[in-house]
Interface confidence: low
């Protein structure tokens, strides 16, 4: 029953050029070149994927000529390496071209850069934007694809796909309507933080899978399938995982084309065996293929079948226990996770994995003791304290959330992540913190049953961004240590991080603490991160200081910009006011 | 964009046969994949047959050595060969079509097979 069984191909290029089309086939190519060389020109990689388009066509006509039968690694390496400023542009990176497949391609992946030296992308006018769009369709989409493409490396391919239509959607209505702006400026908002959240989970898909393999992605996919399609049977949770890891191995590795092309398979094949696998599909299923696919990888919970038996009678009660687990350790723990999820969408996936590996562990332990049974007995009852930590943490982290409002909350999370690990850069501390306190807008307005899938899983995402961030600079021990013993518990392991003691201060530095009059014209959430910049920089000048310390300053702070603002020479007054906050700043924290 | 419009509907005797023509136009040089698909009153929308560009073929069980696909790439157009018909094969029939899924969906063509 495999969706992915195809018969061979001379021409792969071919293949994949006649699968997806010419439109989808520049579009990938253009993705996946953008992904590894992150710092070349738009015209440049234009140039690129005419000339490889220009070849699959040929092998279109003609799947014996000359390379065609060349794999896709291959062919796109090759094209790759022609860029005539590798070397100046990408340094080592350029050392990768002297390599054969595949290590020619492991070594592209490994210069992936998940903070790329980049600028910011600026939003120009509407009306400029809407002549560009005009001007030329075509070029205006491709330059999206490529902007999100080469500031998101593992951006998850197709879904990128979705997004650009969605793109030119808003862009087709809004330059039509009355008050363009009115139109556009919501749509490009909702697109801008709906692609961070998908970059952010894929990039945990692709960790997952790069760093922990593929037996911690199925895992992963097991206990979550299990969750959304309840009454499937086992046997169809394990075939659309086994299709679903294909598909975002391919993607995370770099084989764009078979990704995509593998991912409308997976989507047909679901769409057409809907009856055993979800009740909640039909929607998703009358939907064009790129809408289908992303409405298929959010669906809703199915209902879970009525009168599920107790599952102590074949996992704890019978004898035969260790007997399954010897003939196939995998599946009989896939069956416990997949029987355990399926009752229990009120757990976050990295809750029901702890879950299943203390089951695993004490198996391991107890099927090789005197009496197995009697060992491995009360093995549920190891879950309640693993249940138990995650719930209490949201139900204090929520109260606290509810109390202070979100900008409050993040930066209680701030000065919480700075104490653990002030060795981290400040942009990364910022940005990791202002996303973990997200979570409370995100989850916390949901009911109990909702709360934990929605909190914690959502945590794993922020803190994988974290750890890729480190990975690149690596400063912090403790932060190396939590991201790669467990990938499950990750968080329990940032949460249980104490002050770090052995940290030594940072010295003061008043040009840390200087502002200008520009921070008037900021936007609301700019002038937030100016603010919460200072704090981070605060707490890691005096990683002591109390919360009633901290809390002074910052007020302090936030009534100097405010008064400042409102002056008719606001420089002066910046300049003026400034050192005095900084003076009673140094003071209040005792520098 | 492309257009699709079927062709070739009604009323039919159980054990008779009945083809479908679609014809496509617009963006077609995009289009991969073909297929039928058929809605009965009250049902959701079940898959019949599909074809790729390079002439590959399937079907559902329950179609299985009745139904054949076939297209004629020179005249765009796609057909659906339907024999030894049966009552629960009354349903409204389309057309659809797409680079990787079947994005474009014709208006269909009402197959009512009754004696």
């Known amino acids: 029953r495999g969706v992915f069984r195809r018969d061979a191909h001379k021409s792969e290029v071919a293949h994949r050029f006649k699968d997806l089309g010419e439109e989808n086939f520049k579009a990938l190519v253009l993705i996946a070149f953008a992904q590894y060389l992150q710092q070349c020109p738009f015209e440049d990689h234009v140039k690129l994927v005419n000339e490889v388009t220009e070849f699959a066509k040929t092998c279109v006509a003609d799947e014996s000529a000359e390379n065609c039968d060349k794999s896709l690694h291959t062919l796109f390496g090759d094209k790759l390496c022609t860029v005539a400023t590798l070397r100046e542009t990408y340094g080592e990176m350029a050392d990768c071209c002297a390599k054969q497949e595949p290590e020619r391609n492991e070594c592209f992946l490994q210069h992936k850069d998940d903070n790329p030296n980049l600028p910011r992308l600026v939003r120009p006018e509407v009306d400029v934007m809407c002549t560009a769009f005009h001007d030329n369709e075509e070029t205006f989409l491709k330059k999206y694809l490529y902007e999100i493409a080469r500031r998101h490396p593992y951006f998850y391919a197709p879904e990128l796909l979705f997004f650009a239509k969605r793109y030119k959607a808003a862009f087709t209505e809004c330059c039509q309507a009355a008050d363009k702006a009115a139109c556009l400026l919501p749509k490009l908002d909702e697109l801008r933080d709906e692609g961070k959240a998908s970059s952010a989970k894929q990039r945990l898909k692709c960790a997952s899978l790069q760093k922990f393999g593929e037996r911690a992605f199925k895992a992963w996919a097991v206990a979550r399938l299990s969750q959304r399609f309840p009454k499937a049977e086992f046997a169809e949770v394990s075939k659309l995982v086994t299709d679903l890891t294909k598909v975002h191995t391919e993607c995370c590795h770099g084989d764009l084309l078979e990704c995509a092309d593998d991912r409308a398979d997976l989507a047909k094949y679901i769409c057409e065996n809907q009856d055993s696998i979800s009740s909640k599909l039909k929607e998703c299923c009358e939907k064009p293929l790129l809408e289908k696919s992303h409405c298929i990888a959010e669906v809703e919970n199915d209902e879970m079948p009525a009168d599920l038996p107790s599952l102590a009678a074949d996992f704890v009660e019978s004898k035969d226990v260790c007997k399954n687990y010897a003939e196939a350790k995998d599946v009989f723990l896939g069956m416990f996770l997949y029987e355990y999820a399926r009752r229990h969408p009120d757990y976050s996936v990295v809750l029901l994995l702890r879950l299943a590996k203390t089951y695993e562990t004490t198996l391991e332990k107890c099927c090789a003791a005197a009496d197995p049974h009697e060992c491995y007995a009360k093995v549920f009852d190891e879950f309640k304290p693993l249940v138990e930590e995650p719930q209490n943490l949201i139900k204090q982290n929520c109260e606290l959330f509810e109390q202070l409002g979100e900008y409050k909350f993040q930066n209680a999370l701030l000065v919480r992540y700075t104490k653990k690990v002030p060795q981290v850069s400040t942009p990364t501390l910022v940005e990791v913190s202002r996303n973990l306190g997200k979570v409370g807008s995100k989850c916390c307005k949901h009911p109990e049953a909702k709360r934990m899938p929605c909190a914690e899983d959502y945590l794993s995402v922020v803190l994988n961004q974290l750890c890729v961030l480190h990975e690149k600079t690596p400063v912090s021990d403790r932060v190396t240590k939590c991201c790669t013993e467990s990938l499950v518990n990750r968080r329990p392991c940032f949460s249980a991080l104490e002050v770090d003691e052995t940290y030594v201060p940072k010295e003061f530095n008043a040009e840390t603490f200087t502002f200008h009059a520009d921070i008037c014209t900021l936007s609301e959430k700019e002038r937030q991160i100016k603010k919460q910049t200072a704090l981070v920089e605060l707490v890691k000048h005096k990683p002591k200081a109390t919360k009633e310390q901290l809390k002074a300053v910052m007020d302090d702070f936030a009534a100097f910009v405010e008064k400042c603002c409102k002056a008719d020479d606001k420089e002066t007054c910046f300049a003026e006011e400034g050192k005095k906050l900084v003076a009673a700043s140094q003071a209040a924290l005792g520098l | 964009q492309v257009q699709l419009v079927e062709s070739g509907g009604g009323l039919v005797q159980p054990g008779g046969s009945l083809r479908l023509s679609c014809a496509a136009s617009?963006?077609?040089?995009?289009?991969?994949?073909m297929a039928w698909y058929r809605q009965a009153p009250g049902q959701q929308r079940e898959f019949v047959a599909r074809i790729s560009k390079g002439g590959s073929t399937n079907y559902p069980d329950s179609v299985k050595g009745r139904f054949t696909i076939s297209r004629d790439n020179s005249k765009n157009t796609l057909y659906l060969q339907m024999n030894s018909l049966r009552a629960e094969d009354t349903a409204v029939y389309y057309c659809?079509?797409?680079?990787?899924?079947?994005?474009?969906w014709g208006q269909g063509t009402l197959v009512t097979v009754s004696s």
């Open positions: 617009g963006s077609i040089e995009s289009i991969n994949r």
């Open positions: 659809a079509a797409g680079p990787v899924w079947e994005q474009f």
